[in-house]
């Protein structure tokens, strides 16, 4: 029943130099072209693909290998549906100095934004 773009307002606090992976779930479209946006500018992300969970459910990823101050900001994902751009709720990425203990805040309702996954 139409597009369902998941994502709840989230604040992520990450240590400088650490990786973070965000994800965005899109339901209700067979072939979404998922774009990531930071502070209003599209993030070019050619080596990050997205996963079909089912024919009408997709998850897009944005991987930041090593977060620096310039990466802090407001991120969201968007898709075009019938000529209109649908956008998710934003995630706010903030940084603490390298070596500090990072934590993240998460609103307690359903969200398809991942917690940061420190993989590197």
């Amino acid at each position: 029943a139409g597009l369902k773009l998941m994502g709840a307002p989230v604040k992520l606090t990450v240590s400088q130099g650490q990786p973070v992976k965000l994800n965005c779930s899109v339901e209700g479209m067979e072939e979404p072209d998922i774009q990531w946006v930071k502070d209003g500018a599209v993030v070019q992300n050619l080596d990050q693909l997205y996963i079909p969970v089912s024919e009408q459910h997709w998850i897009g990823f944005l991987s930041l290998k090593s977060v620096e101050r310039s990466d802090a900001g407001r991120y969201w994902c968007q898709v075009e549906d019938g000529g209109e751009t649908e956008i998710s709720q934003p995630v706010w990425l903030t940084l603490v100095p390298r070596g500090s203990s990072a934590h993240h805040h998460h609103h307690h309702h359903h969200s398809a934004w991942s917690h940061p996954q420190f993989e590197k």
Partner: antibody
Framework: EVQLVQSGADVKKPGASLTISCQAS????????ISWVRQKPGKGLEWMGQ????????HYGPSFQGHVTISADRSTATAYLQWRSLEASDTAMYYC??????????????????WGPGTLVTVSS | SYELTQPPSVSVSPGQTARITCSGD??????AYWYQQKSGQAPVLVIY???KRISGIPERFSGSSSGTMATLTISGAQVEDEADYYC???????????FGGGTKLTVL
Amino acid sequence: EVQLVQSGADVKKPGASLTISCQASGYTFTDYWISWVRQKPGKGLEWMGQIRGPASATHYGPSFQGHVTISADRSTATAYLQWRSLEASDTAMYYCVRHQQQTSGGTIPEYYQHWGPGTLVTVSS
Amino acid sequence: SYELTQPPSVSVSPGQTARITCSGDALPKKYAYWYQQKSGQAPVLVIYEDKKRISGIPERFSGSSSGTMATLTISGAQVEDEADYYCYSTSTGGNYMVFGGGTKLTVL
């Protein structure tokens, strides 16, 4: 089983047009992205560009922008690489590459690739 | 345009450790991928996102990255590892992909 079947070798004269193809089977074509990679004889790999299955969005390497066109026909699950005017320097092997990420039970995606066998293009007068 | 720099050749004896480097200004922020290409064959992806090994690739292949340098390490190189190896990553602006010039690994 995933397969990428590329069109056969071709010999053309400079200035001729050419389209080579890469037909996919074994998966839903629009689920994944296809890249084209050039390899001149005895030389290294060069990334030419990419087409994303959904919406057929394209991106090109700076050396190839304006010289080639990447397209796809979703109804036949085929990606294309097209030249309007070939040059001798286009002589090379051309590979199509399918990119895929999927999860195996967890939330962290695994990355896979499949390469076509390559199409040899020879441009000679 | 953005470039990734690799040594043209690396030689090791069987059983030794081979290290192939790749340098690029964007590598502190962009992941490196590594390909193996044996003579007359299509390339095969062995490492993605700096250090993740593709399923089916032997454990002797590993990847690492520090600053502007990514490294492919083959611990206990075998004769069958003789091939050309290419690094691959995203341009600084993230809008196109780039291969390194390739490194010929000789195991003799």
